[in-house]
């Protein structure tokens, strides 16, 4: 960065003005030193200056006043295109009894420190030495418009050069682009688009599909107001200026419709009176989704053909669903909505529930004493079917048996065919209490209520029964 | 627009290995199952396989231990992996996008409802 | 594995004809309907035309039809257009099992 390079010249439209797009007429070399005072931009002596200046205390041996540091007049407005180059500098003449004087450049109030392309140079006389400062830029960006000056501290006291603005003009840069959005049919909704230069004025054109929606150009910023669309639209917008035109980026508008069935379901676990299912949504047609139908009906062809429904949120896309018979077969479908409202059901699907303990106990135990044959018998009726939870295996009867200062529990596997059984008797002069429960592959069901009977003594006689009632029959 | 674009497909010595490749445009592999179907030359379609959502496999029997199907959802493309591969296994592979999966977790298998969209195919020829 | 066979395995027709393609399965479809029908047309892949035994896929036109349920199928072209030449493939699935199995194809052409 420190070779010189010729930077164009122009004059520009109004006094103090550069316009930098043409003819390079003068360069600064990068080198301190005497150099023939080559001025980037014209002095202008005899103009009274506006910016700070510094009275200096000391005098000369012979005690005359020093006249008052200055910045000389330059160049107040620069005005290029994007990514061209640009050089400007301030100048100052210093009494030589001045040592170590430094020059600053600031942007906006900020000192500019770092890897800036600025030069000083010095170039001494008998009295004074002419120093220039020189800033320069290889490819201006809209970053680097602003207003620049030089600062200069001598003897505690600050000299202000006046300032310099940058104007970097080029092709429109959005500040605000239109959006893509979601839309109701047939809703009206705004986009925006703002652009700015320099050069202004900005004026956009919006277009939609490919065509200019509006005829006649608007200042930016603009508001488009779209009444309503029935179909998919891509919008744009131009924003044109003195230098050019530049595209926003197309953005898609989309109608919100009723989503789409969802892609997978999957059965996760199946017990005797519940399925979990989870799913995966379908598309969402552009409005997010609300909640999740589950429908389920029995698959047996006789059962009447009645629909459970569950509702559940739509996330995390898992439901059980419960209060399901065992063993039975289910067809289950999911329906999913959102603003718009409900997809299609998916495809059904086949489910069962499993196997399960019965639920309730056998009916109508009743106990009587065979005493000729030293046995208890017990009778009792099957749980109904719908609460079997299964296919029935068999029962398990508890016997207690209890007299003084005895209590004996003892358990008995029977088969599933029919509904009685006999026991030995295990103490006499006791209380024998009987409680049944049906067993299947899912497991062994509630006991019933216990029936007691009493075992006499040898030689006693009491042949009437014990039972437990049948619902309803209390 | 909704796509799949087959490629991999070559000629191929018996007993080589090759993958191919299905990219998914216009919908995500993390919302849909996704199935392979060869044909070969003047024959009908067979059933490969296919990766759910999840990324479950579940393949045809004549084709396990040979045959893998995965998928990178990041960028949003199946493969299917061909091992010692035999001149029988000459086709046109398609992938096809599957309209509705139902996955059976518990007993490891799953049903395809329907295959709703399908690639222009590429074909594998093994030969030596 | 179940098997699926279609028949006839050639058939040939005129433009205007009413045609009909059977599919029967060794064992029942899942669901009882969760039988597809495919067109495929030479050097193209195959294009999904009914599900579910007899929805219409999006875009078909109206003059195909399908039935039945189980292990019986039907596609039927209730007036074949120069556009319906081509092979035509039924496939399903099948309960306690992963296979998606396609029928052997039917061939319509000109007669």
């Known amino acids: 960065r420190e070779e010189a390079k010729p930077y164009p010249l122009f004059p520009g439209p109004f006094p103090g003005s550069l316009q930098t797009d043409h003819t390079p007429l003068l360069s600064l070399p990068h080198a301190s030193g005497y150099q023939p005072a080559l001025m980037f931009s014209p002095t202008q002596p005899g103009r009274p200056h506006t910016g700070n200046v510094a009275i200096p205390q000391v005098t000369s041996v012979e005690s005359k006043p020093l006249p008052p540091l200055a910045f000389k007049h330059t160049v107040g407005h620069i005005i290029l295109s994007e990514h061209k180059g640009v050089k400007f500098n301030c100048s100052i003449s210093v009494p030589n009894i001045y040592q170590d004087t430094t020059i600053s450049w600031w942007k906006d109030g900020k000192e500019l420190l770092g890897a800036h392309h600025a030069i000083t140079q010095f170039y001494p006389d008998d009295e004074v030495t002419a120093i220039i400062a020189s800033f320069s830029i290889t490819s201006v960006q809209r970053s680097d418009n602003g207003s620049y000056i030089c600062k200069m501290k001598i003897n505690n006291e600050e000299i202000v050069s006046d300032p310099i603005y940058i104007e970097v003009q080029g092709l429109p840069h959005f500040t605000k682009q239109p959006e893509s959005m979601n839309v109701t049919r047939n809703t009206a909704f705004n986009l925006t688009c703002q652009a700015v230069g320099p050069p202004e004025p900005v004026n956009i054109f919006w277009v939609q599909n490919s065509s200019r929606v509006n005829e006649q150009p608007e200042k930016s910023p603009s508001v488009l107001t779209v009444p309503g669309l029935t179909e998919m639209a891509v919008f744009s917008c131009e924003a044109h200026n003195d230098k050019g035109l530049t595209v926003s980026k197309g953005v898609q508008i989309n109608i919100k419709a009723i989503p789409s069935p969802p892609t997978e379901v999957s059965i996760r676990n199946s017990t005797a009176h519940s399925i979990l299912i989870s799913w995966v949504p379908g598309f969402d047609g552009y409005s997010p989704f609300r909640n999740c139908s589950i429908q389920v009906k029995e698959a047996d062809p006789l059962s009447n053909g009645s629909v459970m429904i569950f509702n559940t949120s739509a996330l995390p896309h898992l439901y059980q669903i419960k209060q399901l018979q065992a063993l039975a077969n289910y067809s289950i479908g999911v329906s999913c909505m959102n603003e718009i409202g409900w997809s299609a059901v998916s495809p059904w699907i086949l489910a069962s529930t499993t196997e399960g303990a019965p639920s309730v106990a056998p009916l109508n135990v009743t106990v009587f004493l065979n005493e000729s044959s030293d046995n208890v018998d017990i009778r009792w009726m099957k749980p109904p079917t719908k609460q079997q939870d299964g296919e029935l295996v068999g029962y398990r009867i508890s016997h207690v048996w209890q007299s003084a200062g005895i209590s004996k529990e003892l358990l008995e596997e029977v088969g599933q065919n029919g509904s009685r059984a006999r026991i030995s008797v295990q103490v006499h002069n006791a209380t024998c209490t009987v409680r049944i429960a049906a067993v299947t592959r899912g497991g062994v069901g509630p006991f019933s209520d216990p029936v007691k009977i009493f075992i006499p003594a040898h030689g006693w006689v009491d042949y009437a029964p014990s039972s437990t009632p049948a619902p309803g029959n209390a | 627009e909704q796509q799949l674009v087959e490629s991999g497909g070559g000629l191929i010595q018996p007993g080589g290995s090759l993958r191919l490749s299905c990219a998914v445009s216009?919908?995500?592999?993390?919302?849909?199952?996704m199935s392979w179907v060869r044909q070969a030359p003047g024959k009908g379609l067979e059933w490969i396989g296919i990766?759910?959502?999840?990324?479950?496999?579940y393949s045809a029997s004549w084709a396990k231990g040979r045959f893998t199907i995965s998928k990178d959802s990041s960028k949003n493309t199946m493969y299917l992996q061909m091992n010692s591969l035999r001149a029988e296994d000459t086709a046109v592979y398609f992938c096809?996008?599957?309209?509705?999966?139902?996955?059976?977790?518990?007993?490891?298998?799953?049903?395809?409802?329907?295959?709703?969209?399908w690639g222009q195919g590429t074909l594998v020829t093994v030969s030596s | 594995d179940a098997q699926m066979t279609q028949s006839p395995s050639t058939l040939s027709a005129s433009v205007g004809d009413r045609v009909t393609i059977t599919c029967q399965s060794s064992?029942?479809?899942?669901?009882?309907?969760?039988l597809s029908w495919y067109q495929q047309k030479p050097g193209k892949p195959p294009k999904l035309l009914i599900y579910?035994?007899?929805d219409l896929a999006s875009g078909v036109p109206s003059r195909f039809s399908g039935s039945g349920s189980g292990t019986e199928f039907t596609l039927t072209i209730s007036s074949l257009q120069p556009d319906d030449f081509a092979t035509y493939y039924c496939?399903?699935?099948?309960?306690?099992?992963?296979?998606?199995?396609f029928g052997g194809g039917t061939k319509v052409e000109i007669k």
């Open positions: 096809a996008r599957v309209g509705f999966f139902v996955g059976y977790g518990a007993y490891d298998y799953g049903i395809i409802h329907r295959l709703d969209l």
């Open positions: 216009g919908f995500s592999l993390s919302s849909n199952a």
């Open positions: 990766i759910s959502s999840s990324g479950s496999t």
């Open positions: 064992k029942s479809i899942y669901n009882n309907n969760w």
């Open positions: 579910d035994a007899s």
């Open positions: 496939a399903g699935g099948y309960s306690g099992d992963s296979d998606y199995a």
